[in-house]
Interface confidence: medium
């Protein structure tokens, strides 16, 4: 009976012996499992965030480009309705152009001598900028970044003048200092005559052949509405 | 659809002055400057002038200024070029042509008239 | 005034074959130009417009290429109706000028 017991014993001491080194290895391979969906979890983790960052970054991308989008389809739904109709009124500025209180502005890339920027405006029924105020010489600034850039105002004919009539004397100014001196020095014939904004913004004189970027403007009609979107 | 239809065959004595019609249709007249072109016979083209019908405002080229008058009449989409001390060397075809609109890019003919010949004989 | 210089001022080509002809500027025009076509007795036809877009309704064997003083017009493979005359046109301020003009013939 002894050895019987002694039989069963190490039976049970064999058995609990594989279950001990079965379970042994299920921990094991779970523990290692367990890494893996640690790992797995992780790197689902920082995938999410990112496709969270994607999404937002499209999403402003988006609202840029909705209003863009609301934007030119209110400027080309007024240019149709212009076009529909027979009036000779201005009612929105064209397309490539920037509207400004009540007026549009178009910004040249390429430099031109004074008198042919001037000719280039006026075949777009549209004038070189007149600036009449400080916060029209702010927006023009803004747009043209430190460029010498042609303005509609020169002396050519003796006293400074804006090309679209506006009054010199009792307007905005906006000069550097010691500007305008009609200087000589420069050797390229004669004195300054034309009026550019400098890299600063303020105003300077200068020989009129120089080939600087310019800015067209031309206002809105007045009694003009803005369209209803369609 | 865009038109431009011109005025017939003139005959012209030297000296004398002659005035082309171009009527516009199928777009809004204002919205657009018209120009003149013309071609004597076997010759190449040549630019003569523009007129903004909006604004009235007018370029013409160096060598017909003070001779060439362009007009336009908005209330009956009409656009006129007149050319005045009539030289027979002002034998040619006269066209009108509708500058395209694209502001701030590059402009363009679109558009032309059928052309007026005009003839300065004695 | 700006100069415009138009080359060839004649060529004879066949059906099929593959056409250049050269507009050159005497300063900068960026891409300020226009080609046309013009049949005997007819006004002239918009072909090309700034330079390289094709106007409306005109075949897509014309291209146009260049910017600044050097634009070229290529007829990739010539058909019947192109035998005409062409010319290019700067609209870089007034006056707005034409090229001399190229007179393509049947060879």
């Known amino acids: 009976q002894n050895s019987q017991l002694q039989e069963e014993l190490r039976g049970l001491r064999e058995t609990f012996s594989n279950f001990t080194a079965s379970t042994e290895a299920q921990v094991k391979g779970l523990s290692t499992q367990g890494g893996n969906v640690g790992r797995k979890m992780k790197s689902l983790e920082s995938q999410l965030e990112k496709q969270q960052k994607d999404l937002s970054e499209d999403h402003s991308s988006l609202l840029l480009h909705v209003k863009q989008f609301v934007s030119d389809l209110r400027s080309l739904s007024c240019q149709m309705a212009a076009l529909q109709g027979n009036g000779s009124e201005r009612t929105c500025c064209p397309v490539n152009w920037v509207e400004h209180e009540r007026s549009c502005y178009w910004f040249s890339r390429s430099g031109k001598a004074w008198a042919d920027a001037d000719n280039y405006c006026r075949l777009e029924d549209a004038h070189l900028v007149v600036v009449t105020s400080w916060e029209e010489q702010k927006f023009v600034q803004h747009h043209i970044g430190p460029v010498n850039t042609w303005m509609g105002l020169h002396d050519q004919n003796g006293p400074w003048k804006w090309v679209d009539g506006t009054d010199y004397e009792t307007g905005f100014k906006n000069w550097r200092p010691e500007q305008p001196d009609d200087w000589y020095g420069h050797g390229l014939g004669g004195g300054e005559d034309c009026a550019h904004f400098t890299d600063d913004g303020r105003w300077n004189d200068d020989v009129c052949q120089r080939p600087y970027r310019w800015v067209c403007e031309t206002e809105l009609d007045k009694a003009s509405q803005e369209p209803p979107l369609l | 659809e865009v038109q431009l239809v011109q005025s017939g065959a003139e005959v012209k004595k030297p000296g004398s002055s002659v005035k082309v019609s171009c009527k516009a249709s199928?777009?809004?007249?204002?919205?657009?400057?018209i120009n003149w072109v013309r071609q004597a016979p076997g010759q190449g083209l040549e630019w003569m002038g523009e007129?903004?019908?909006?604004?009235?405002?007018?370029f013409y080229a160096q060598k017909f200024q003070g001779r060439v008058t362009i007009t336009a009449d908005k209330s009956t989409s009409t656009a006129y070029m007149e050319l005045s001390s009539l030289r027979s060397e002002d034998t040619a075809v006269y066209y009108c042509a509708r500058k395209g609109r694209e502001y701030g890019t590059s402009h363009y003919f679109d558009y032309w008239g059928q052309g007026t010949t005009v003839t300065v004989s004695s | 005034d700006i100069q415009m210089t138009q080359s060839p001022s004649s060529l004879s080509a066949s059906v099929g074959d593959r056409v250049t002809i050269t507009c050159r500027i005497s300063e900068n025009i960026y891409s300020n130009l226009a080609w046309y076509q013009q049949k005997p007795g007819k006004a002239p036809k918009l072909l090309i417009y700034a330079a390289i877009n094709l106007a409306e309704g005109v075949p897509s064997r014309f291209s146009g290429s260049g910017s600044g003083t050097d634009f070229t017009l290529t007829i990739s493979s010539l058909q019947p109706e192109d035998f005409a005359t062409y010319y290019c046109q700067h609209f870089w301020g007034t006056p707005f000028t034409f090229g001399q003009g190229t007179k393509l013939e049947i060879k």
């Open positions: 199928g777009y809004t007249f204002t919205a657009y400057g």
């Open positions: 007129i903004f019908p909006r604004s009235d405002q007018t």
